[in-house]
Interface confidence: medium
Amino acid sequence: DAHKSEVAHRFKDLGEENFKALVLIAFAQYLQQCPFEDHVKLVNEVTEFAKTCVADESAENCDKSLHTLFGDKLCTVATLRETYGEMADCCAKQEPERNECFLQHKDDNPNLPRLVRPEVDVMCTAFHDNEETFLKKYLYEIARRHPYFYAPELLFFAKRYKAAFTECCQAADKAACLLPKLDELRDEGKASSAKQRLKCASLQKFGERAFKAWAVARLSQRFPKAEFAEVSKLVTDLTKVHTECCHGDLLECADDRADLAKYICENQDSISSKLKECCEKPLLEKSHCIAEVENDEMPADLPSLAADFVESKDVCKNYAEAKDVFLGMFLYEYARRHPDYSVVLLLRLAKTYETTLEKCCAAADPHECYAKVFDEFKPLVEEPQNLIKQNCELFEQLGEYKFQNALLVRYTKKVPQVSTPTLVEVSRNLGKVGSKCCKHPEAKRMPCAEDYLSVVLNQLCVLHEKTPVSDRVTKCCTESLVNRRPCFSALEVDETYVPKEFNAETFTFHADICTLSEKERQIKKQTALVELVKHKPKATKEQLKAVMDDFAAFVEKCCKADDKETCFAEEGKKLVAASQAALGL
């Protein structure tokens, strides 16, 4: 629908509170280095302007697009050139090029200080003193660190954040109440950010068709009783929502997401029997609940897929009629029958099917040519099954920390050029697949594991894209979205890598390690492990294990010593010498 004033339309649809929150998120995701106060000022100016447009849609500038209005506002920031360098050149462009330019300058790894959690009493005082500012600051800090965070979902996180403080700041033991809730929000938030980052990468790097294929497969698994036309409609609407959010159109995205939730709930009888509880919740909870809803039961007595997609004499004719519709139907039919497969596996099967039809429908005897296409699926299905089985066995033997270390060694040998912090972050996350997925029964392991790995490997891809150092990473990240994991799995030790020069400073530790949390201490040790492998890529597992065991004993010993710093200095030198000897450095 055409509206005289887009800004007035969105303000009325979303309400003032959500409007202000979403504009703040949008601005913080674009200008990630700007101080909080500057953003609040910009948001208030935009909000006051929106109110004038609500009062009179014909008022001056009210007919401008949101990109024009927001871009003009961002370009008033005085320190743009000093703070952002070449991003300031975006302001010389016209829409839509200006917005595209801002999008290209979003930084997945901004140089921002780590968020340190203050004492609980300090947080509760700040919350009570000015609740609105406290919550805005939460939105701002998350948005600037996660420039692709799914904005309407961030509103849901903020609502839970507020609820946690409202409840816990009145509790007898504030810390016992609040800290687990904040930990849960932090972990869920990181996971949500990473999942959304994959959606945006899919749209931006591989196009709408790739995203739609992903959505057909996932929604067909989730809503196996829904008809193909219904799934297709949901896919179109979902694609619009995510295209908008990934493109910085956060007001439109939130508005359209609300409309989609409304549609799903109004039509739940023809979509899924699992939606009832979700649809009784308020808007933000409802949308979140729908996004996470469990798979509905598969309809009974679904006919064999082979009848329509292999045995039918009409396969090539139906394919020629509307290729993407026919492939969409194939994906829908396969996915609704296979909640036990990962989405990426389903997409590989659909790609294999498409390639076979492209080849066979131009052949002299098409049917004879594609008759065995389902046989080609067998190795594609078995590969992730076997990989998950092996890795879950390894995880069960080693536990999470040592499993992460095994992956650290494996991935450092594959792509040693990648920065150590990135290798540590990505391998730690890859290792979490064990505790996240191996506990599931066979039928749920693959969708859990392989789709989670897709999210984690996308983190590697976006971080590597910022500073490309490895052709192998670039190749695996860019050639095929659905084959990223098999591509990385297939990489062997990089024989072309010239080992890093040994630097004793890298392996010098201080007493501050003793006061770190267990997680931070693990990261320090894992950082050392990566550096070891970079120095000695041909080191055996046994050699590395011996050095890491010595290192753990060294840290434990010195942290118990009276003069910790002296212990670290003296024993550290001995450890470095022993490690060099053990590894032949």
Epitope: S232, D314, K317, E321, A322, D324, V325, A362
Partner: antibody, heavy 119, light 111 residues
Framework: EVQLVQSGAEVKKPGESLKISCKGS????????IGWVRQMPGEGLEWMGI????????RYSPSFEGQVTISADKSISTAYLQWSSLKASDTAMYYC????????????WGQGTLVTVSS | QSALTQPASVSGSPGQSITISCSGI?????????VSWYQQYPGKAPKLIIY???KRPSGVSNRFSGSKSGNTASLTISGLQADDEAEYSC???????????FGGGTQLTVL
């Protein structure tokens, strides 16, 4: 080079029968749908129906069902449109098009056949 | 009566941009971007200028662009030229086992 060549213009009387043709060349005739389109004088385009020469599967737009017959002979890569009893209202230009899917993507067109029905 | 609705005529001056709308796109056609646009000069066969909503066949000027919002597709011609004066028709997929449909056509006049 892909080409669709249609038969020449026809002048007929009401009640007469007629069969016009569309010969494809330069591509695999059996693997693409062929569509027929009517354009009455001064009017817009209308899809009449489609045929898949590979197995002669034929579909008609509701307003043309029973009014015309679409057929194909894959051995000579030719599609046909025929009337058993013409009416004055059948006066129009008729085009055939190769369809890249029935998604209305007619990427190659014949030059058109003008059919005039008048007593 | 066409299932797709287009304005009967639009006009613009050389150098300007014009947009022709085509409403009534089915949900399935929308989901899979199955909308095409044709240009037709008097006495000539139609020519495909846009397919799958936004794609241009090779040889078609980049002044022609397509888009879609909801159940409405649009054709935009930028930098109008005298030889753009023609009839423009949209066409869309009508569902499996069905025949596609055309819009009523829009006559573009370059002033």
């Amino acid at each position: 080079e892909v080409q669709l060549v249609q038969s020449g213009a026809e002048v007929k009387k009401p009640g007469e029968s007629l069969k016009i043709s569309c010969k494809g060349s330069g591509y695999s005739f059996t693997n693409y749908w062929i569509g027929w389109v009517r354009q009455m004088p001064g009017e817009g385009l209308e899809w009449m129906g489609i045929i898949y020469p590979g197995d002669s599967d034929t579909r008609y737009s509701p307003s043309f069902e029973g009014q015309v017959t679409i057929s194909a002979d894959k051995s000579i890569s030719t599609a046909y449109l025929q009337w058993s009893s013409l009416k004055a209202s059948d006066t129009a230009m008729y085009y055939c098009a190769r369809l890249h899917g029935v998604v209305s993507r007619g990427d190659y067109w014949g030059q058109g056949t003008l059919v005039t029905v008048s007593s | 009566q066409s299932a797709l609705t287009q304005p009967a005529s639009v006009s613009g001056s050389p150098g300007q941009s014009i947009t022709i709308s085509c409403s009534g796109i089915s949900s399935l056609a929308g989901s899979y971007n199955l909308v095409s646009w044709y240009q037709q000069y008097p006495g000539k066969a139609p020519k495909l200028i846009i397919y799958e909503v936004t794609k241009r066949p090779s040889g078609v000027s980049n002044r022609f662009s397509g888009s879609k919002s909801g159940n409405t597709a649009s054709l935009t011609i930028s930098g109008l030229q005298a030889d753009d004066e023609a009839e423009y028709s949209c066409s869309s997929y009508a569902g499996r086992n069905a025949v596609a449909v055309f819009g009523g056509g829009t006559q573009l006049t370059v002033l």
